[in-house]
């Protein structure tokens, strides 16, 4: 059976009723977050390997909405929810408090001021 | 403005009203083609860098619907249409008459009998 997906912003990717867009321009984490917010979206949140299995195919590194809380060492999403165990393998690439998404559900720690491409997501 | 995408088979990726699915199981080109056909789709056809810019992000190698015609050296899609120039860089990885899609609009020549993952596509 066929079905429609969305609704999503024009020309975004729709998968399992979530909307994704990959942005080519390099921005720091804060600018990336602002860019997503301006489009009524947020930086990528990884919440399910099953519902987001398209992410295993993504090449390169892109900012996602995951940040490190230095005071307690936890990893949280922009919305304040805590990273679920077994979802991402967090790799210490640089000293930093932000994370880049890389293929096969890996997260690379990076300085939040470093420019990178980014992924915005909108949950429908 | 937001809009719906599709219609697509359940759990396929929808982008600019085309439907895509990435299959993990390795099959030869002919089996991959049959698998797509059984789902009322075809192997990936690359026809536009603009309309299919999500493909630049794809990691790894996957069968697409491009075949080499040994008698005249042309590259054609399953539907008989000719590969447009400037769309794909065709790289001679192996001697063969089928092509794997790889990120950034590259096509790798491979023996059609070699098992690989594959991308199905359905144009809406």
């Amino acid at each position: 059976t066929e079905s429609y997906c969305g609704p999503c912003p024009k020309n975004w990717i729709c998968y399992k009723n979530n909307c994704y867009q990959f942005f080519d321009e390099s921005k720091n984490w804060y600018e990336s977050q602002a860019s997503c917010m301006s489009q009524n979206a947020s930086l990528l949140k990884v919440y399910s390997k099953e519902d987001q299995d398209l992410l295993k195919l993504v090449k390169s590194y892109h900012w996602m909405g995951l940040v490190h809380i230095p005071t307690n060492g936890s990893w949280q999403w922009e919305d304040g929810s805590i990273l679920s165990p077994n979802l991402l393998t967090i790799i210490e690439m640089q000293k930093g408090d932000c994370a880049l998404y890389a293929s096969s559900f890996k997260g690379y720690i990076e300085n939040c001021s470093t420019p990178n491409t980014y992924i915005c997501m909108q949950r429908t | 403005t937001e809009s719906y995408c599709g219609p697509c088979p359940k759990n396929w990726i929808c982008y600019k009203n085309n439907c895509y699915q990435f299959f993990d199981e390795s099959k030869n080109w002919y089996e991959s083609q049959a698998s797509c056909m059984s789902q009322n789709a075809s192997l990936l056809k690359v026809y536009s860098k603009e309309d299919q810019d999500l493909l630049k992000l794809v990691k790894s190698y996957h069968w697409m619907g491009l075949v080499h015609i040994p008698t005249n050296g042309s590259w054609q899609w399953e539907d008989g249409s000719i590969l447009s120039p400037n769309l794909l860089t065709i790289i001679e990885m192996q001697k063969g008459d089928c092509a794997l899609y790889a990120s950034s609009f590259k096509g790798y020549i491979e023996n059609c009998s070699t098992p690989n993952t594959y991308i199905c596509m359905q144009r809406t």
């Epitope: - | 080499h68 015609i69 040994p70 005249n72 050296g73 042309s74 590259w75 249409s81 000719i82 590969l83 447009s84 120039p85 400037n86 794909l88 860089t89 065709i90 790289i91 001679e92 192996q94 001697k95 096509g107 020549i109």
Partner: antibody, heavy 122, light 107 residues
């Protein structure tokens, strides 16, 4: 700078043989298909033969099939054309040309060498 | 084999003129067409590829158009250095074939 330099042309009798060479520089030779194109005196251009980057695909014009052999040595950045059973109608300037764009779906020729003249006459 | 028919075989024009050369393929070749310029005693030079893409370093007065079977090379304002012979070539299949050439001469 991309450069192609042909050599090996000359005067040969009908039925004779000649081997043309093309030395390439300024680009990654092993990534490109290569070609021979000829031009008879006062005439137009005629494609002769093409060889893919790894020599997997080789094509010849009907007029030279069975008599000419194209080959390449990627380690030496060199392209060759072995010409046997030469005929008067093979008299032409022979150009070596790189296939463009990069890869196996190379539809056109850029750049071209300066050419080498092959004269077949008794 | 795909035949390429070029017309006219020669054209006389003056500096500043607009010159149009046409090329017809005997079967559809999508956009797999190139145009070359050749001056006497010199090797051909690629001007246009993929029917309409201008090769790097080629002046913008040269343009190409067409798809399928009918193609055009246009020189918008002929310059003294443009007097030469022009060839079209299909690149979709082997054997690669050229048009017969168009000689652009000074009027």
């Amino acid at each position: 700078e991309v450069q192609l330099v042909e050599s090996g042309g000359g005067l040969v009798k009908p039925g004779g043989s000649l081997r043309l060479s093309c030395a390439a520089s300024g680009f990654t030779f092993s990534s490109y298909s290569m070609n021979w194109v000829r031009q008879a005196p006062g005439k137009g251009l005629e494609w002769v033969s093409s060889i893919s980057s790894s020599s997997s695909y080789i094509y010849y014009a009907d007029s030279v099939k069975g008599r000419f052999t194209i080959s390449r040595d990627n380690a030496k950045n060199s392209l060759y054309l072995q010409m046997n059973s030469l005929r008067a109608e093979d008299t032409a300037v022979y150009y070596c040309a790189r296939g463009a764009p990069v890869g196996a779906a190379a539809g056109w020729f850029d750049p071209w060498g300066q050419g080498t003249l092959v004269t077949v006459s008794s | 084999d795909i035949q390429m028919t070029q017309s006219p075989s020669s054209v006389s024009a003056s500096v500043g003129d607009r010159v149009t050369i046409t090329c017809r393929a005997s079967q559809g070749i999508s956009s797999w067409l190139a145009w070359y310029q050749q001056k006497p005693g010199k090797a051909p030079k690629l001007l246009i590829y993929a029917a309409s893409s201008l090769q790097s370093g080629v002046p913008s007065r040269f343009s190409g158009s067409g798809s399928g079977t009918d193609f055009t090379l246009t020189i918008s304002s002929l310059q003294p250095e443009d007097f030469a012979t022009y060839y079209c070539q299909q690149g979709v299949s082997f054997p690669r074939t050229f048009g017969g050439g168009t000689k652009v001469e000074i009027k």
